[in-house]
């Protein structure tokens, strides 16, 4: 039903669902600080343009006595518990910002008359997409396969000379919740990357990817997966790899690897890392101190919403416009705002667009150094090392399939 | 509209050093690869090195590796070229490009004419 | 390296003449770069992955070719197109140019 918003006559209310079960397991304490430190900055941006205007934060949180797995599994219900909440309190702001579950997300836009902004600190799934009033400031699963897809595809630089065309995806269930829609998109028979590939067959055991690694018969030499080094050292540790071999680890929300005492182990000489472009003024801010690097950028998320919301605010205000509308519930996309780490754009539905680094281990200085980086915004590769020390053969990234000729 | 402009023409001695520099504008400099070409009188042109301006990262061609120093100032969006040790076999035109990739050198800069003559 | 011998060195020709380039490299290469340079003047990019004219290059330019034999081909010669024209590939590293072709007025 029609909730009425506490957002009119100078007094602006942004609803912030604190939910129990979480796309990273952060305490809600530290998102709390998060959406007050935006709060802060909102204020000033909006006092530096002589709007005369209140700003708060309403913090609606779940009983926790039904929905208490902590991660996304049993979130699908507690979304749309806490908007009953607000609905029965009437205290329903300007804009939403939480659930950050896919499922939760999904199935509070699937059932509720959304005619207000929704603002997601992840909802990673390729079931989130192009929705209306849904914006998501996290690196979405179909911003991941379209590079995937570009990377697959070329075979005009000096260090990728072959077209690839196969994979393999390992996944076995005990992900987290961004690998976990990240891997179930490349998975998906329908998904633009499956559509793309000849061949993809999905490891579910950890001998089948043991295996498949001195494999003489394997079907590809690509093997994408999700999480970090430690992850991927539990799973293969020391075991010989065949030097055809090429592991994708996708760890986009991991800045571990730009830190400067940080050297590589001997298990990452035969993978490429594919994290996101790290920001630089977070580490010394208040909310961002005692924090991990993934939590990090789960926190910036929650105030990037903040400050999307203050600039949206803004420009309506200077027009002269209502923002219990329609209008401001669809504007929240095409369009780049400033965040607390520098500019943040997002696409013409509402996804983040961010710069996703490929980085490679160095033989030389066993170090991780920067392969190339792609633009999301453009699906556009920048080449950075045009002359990799790579394990691989001719340090040249070697063909997706054993045994055929050159491209 | 992207310009790479290079500084003037070079005379130098044997055993000199010299630095050209190219100053990029029309585009966002950390955004590419920045190339060095050499074309000495009546020869191909032949790629000396590559920087990225963002990272820092810096290739040679294992040719000019003890000849040529690249480095940038990206605060000045301006890349430059270090030549060492001067011979005469280094007289030539000395060309900054940029790279976009998929289209490599896509925009040169005038030329730098270094002379090197005792 | 990558050697990389175009044919022919000089070539002279009329206005309105199809005038085609070969390139040959020594070992196979998935695409080749053209660019165009007059005296006086830097080399311009003109066509990027054996096919692709470059921004403001004309139509009666192409270029096509595989593995080790590339051709730039320019359908009817027109004044402004006498210059040299040097083949690049950046299959492997470090990228090399040919030696040039230079296109004269007969």
């Known amino acids: 039903s029609q909730v009425s918003q506490n957002c009119h006559n100078g007094s602006y209310e942004i609803s912030v669902l604190m939910m129990g079960n979480s796309a990273f397991a952060e305490p809600l304490k530290n998102l709390e600080d998060a959406v007050n430190e935006g709060l802060e900055i909102v204020r000033g941006r909006l006092q530096n343009a002589g709007l005369n205007v209140t700003v708060n934060a309403t913090f609606m949180y779940s009983d926790g006595l039904i929905h208490n797995s902590g991660d996304c599994r049993s979130s699908t219900c507690e979304g749309l518990d806490l908007l009953r909440k607000i609905s029965n309190a009437q205290r329903m702001g300007c804009v939403l910002i939480g659930p950050s579950c896919t499922y939760s997300t999904f199935q509070m836009y699937l059932d509720t008359e959304l005619s207000y902004p929704m603002i997601s600190a992840g909802s990673f799934g390729l079931s989130c997409d192009y929705k209306e009033t849904l914006t998501r400031l996290m690196s979405p699963a179909r911003k991941l396969m379209y590079f995937l897809v570009n990377f697959w595809k070329t075979n005009d630089l000096p260090f990728k000379t072959y077209s690839w065309s196969t994979s393999y995806v390992y996944k076995n269930g005990t992900e987290t919740e961004d690998c976990f829609w990240y891997l179930n998109a490349l998975e998906a028979s329908v998904s633009y990357f499956s559509h793309e590939l000849g061949f993809k067959v999905v490891l579910r055991q950890d001998k089948e990817f043991q295996d498949i690694l001195m494999d003489h018969n394997r079907k590809s030499n690509v093997i994408i997966m999700c999480g970090g080094p430690e992850f991927l050292y539990k799973l293969k540790g020391d075991r010989a790899v065949a030097e055809d071999i090429v592991i994708i680890l996708v760890d986009l929300f991991n800045d571990q690897y730009f830190e400067d005492n940080v050297t590589a182990p001997d298990y990452m000489k035969n993978v490429l890392v594919l994290t996101l472009s790290p920001g630089n003024s977070l580490l010394n801010s208040s909310f961002s101190r005692n924090l991990s690097p993934t939590k990090r950028d789960f926190a910036l998320a929650y105030l990037n919403g903040i400050l999307l919301f203050g600039h949206m605010l803004k420009i309506f205000l200077e027009n002269g416009e209502n923002i219990t509308t329609p209008k401001f519930a669809h504007a929240f996309r095409n369009l780049t705002f400033e965040g607390y780490d520098g500019p943040v754009t997002l696409d013409d539905w509402g996804d983040v667009d961010s710069t996703m680094v490929l980085l490679y281990t160095s033989v030389d200085t066993k170090k991780y150094k920067v392969l190339l980086t792609y633009d999301t915004h453009v699906n556009k590769t920048y080449p950075v090392d045009m002359s990799p020390t790579f394990t691989w053969k001719n340090s040249k990234l070697p063909n997706d399939i054993t045994g055929r000729g050159p491209q | 509209e992207v310009q790479l402009v290079q500084s003037g023409a070079e005379v130098k001695k044997p055993g000199a050093s010299v630095k050209v520099s190219c100053k990029a504008s029309?585009?966002?400099?950390?955004?590419?690869?920045m190339n060095w070409v050499k074309q000495a009188p009546g020869q191909r042109l032949e790629w000396m090195g590559v920087m990225n301006p963002k990272f820092g990262t810096i290739n040679y061609n294992q040719k000019f590796k003890d000849k040529a120093t690249i480095t940038r100032d990206t605060s000045a969006s301006t890349a430059y070229m270090e030549l060492s040790s001067l011979r005469s076999e280094d007289t030539a035109v000395y060309y900054c490009?940029?790279?976009?990739?998929?289209?490599?050198?896509?925009?040169w800069g005038q030329g730098t004419t270094v002379t090197v003559s005792s | 390296d990558i050697q990389l011998t175009q044919s022919p060195s000089f070539l002279s020709a009329s206005p309105g003449d199809r005038v085609t380039i070969t390139c040959s490299a020594s070992s196979s290469v998935n695409y080749m770069y053209w660019y165009q340079q007059k005296p006086g003047s830097s080399p311009k990019s003109w066509i990027y992955r054996t096919s692709n004219l470059a921004s403001g290059v004309p139509s009666r330019f192409s270029g096509s070719g595989s593995g080790t034999e590339y051709t730039l081909t320019i359908s009817s010669l027109q004044p402004e197109d006498f210059a040299t024209y040097y083949c690049?590939?950046?299959?492997?590293?470090?990228?090399?140019f040919g030696g040039g072709t230079k296109v004269e007025i007969k």
């Open positions: 029309g585009y966002t400099f950390t955004d590419h690869n």
């Open positions: 490009a940029r790279d976009n990739y998929p289209n490599y050198f896509d925009y």
């Open positions: 690049q590939q950046y299959h492997d590293y470090p990228p090399t």
